[in-house]
């Protein structure tokens, strides 16, 4: 579900949403840490309907969801985290 990308590209997100997205509509979540060309952390949600949404990292819902995923991964098997460069 979670993917962390380290990239040298500039910021990906022009517009960010804070609206809750139910998990059944989510395919995967990309986390782009700040640095390497972008001064802020970016969260990109890839939805099952093939659309993509940039989520405000400060949005309460995404922070709550990340916490749930962290707790789940620490109490069971780790959630796969993919670290790779985007060409």
């Amino acid at each position: 579900v979670l993917e962390v990308y380290y990239t040298s590209l500039r910021c990906r997100c022009v517009q960010e949403s804070s609206v809750f997205i139910p998990r059944r509509f989510i395919d995967r979540i990309q986390i782009l840490p700040r640095g390497n060309g972008c001064p802020r952390k970016e969260i990109i949600v890839w939805k099952k309907n093939k659309s993509i949404v940039c989520v405000d990292p400060q949005a309460e819902w995404i922070q709550r969801m990340m916490e749930v995923l962290r707790k789940r991964s620490s109490s069971t098997l780790p959630v796969p985290v993919f670290k790779r460069k985007i060409p």
Partner: antibody
Framework: EVQLVQSGGGLVQPGGSLRLSCAAS????????MSWVRQAPGKGLEWVGE????????NYAPSLKDRFTISRDNAKNSLYLQMNSVRAEDTAVYYC?????????????WGQGTTVTVSS | DIQMTQSPSSLSASVGDRVTITCKAS??????VAWYQQKPGKAPKLLIY???YRYTGVPSRFSGSGSGTDFTFTISSVQPEDIATYYC?????????FGGGTKLEIK
Amino acid sequence: EVQLVQSGGGLVQPGGSLRLSCAASGIDFSRYWMSWVRQAPGKGLEWVGEINPDSSTINYAPSLKDRFTISRDNAKNSLYLQMNSVRAEDTAVYYCARQDDYEYYAMDYWGQGTTVTVSS
Amino acid sequence: DIQMTQSPSSLSASVGDRVTITCKASQDVNTGVAWYQQKPGKAPKLLIYSASYRYTGVPSRFSGSGSGTDFTFTISSVQPEDIATYYCQQYYSTPLTFGGGTKLEIK
């Protein structure tokens, strides 16, 4: 203008079957999840179930999944609810609704409702 | 299933009053809560989504707040046209569930 026009309601005997329809216009029907919600006389809203755009995922209220079947025909812009082995407690107004998964993620457009009466 | 407990079941207010409805989820639903307005003989209408966001065209007197298990819906200044029944709904996970409704009457 988005419209969800419902049909197929009526009087049905206990144990009988009925198929409700919901015809959509003004939206790209094939892109959206759709839901059915019902409301018994003088009661609150009860979710019946939902179907995704390509019909590969259908979720039901646990108490109804053995008797009710949700389907859709994207070529006809139509949503269906097949009700089998109906009981008196299935008497209700049935609503179809668009379950938006692009911006709001809630039920943003509703049909006018169709009344189902189960009685002998 | 996630239960949504809504209160009060009915309330009476004067025009201009501020009214508040609460909804409590039986487990964490993040901010996956919507509020609907239903007038007699009509289909429900979406007012609030994601706990606190007003749907297109909804007057600013309607607002929502909350996260986790506790949610609030407020009408800051009740108008005669607000006579209706209001429902909360969780759409965090299936089966989707509604609160029992709050019937608003005008004194």
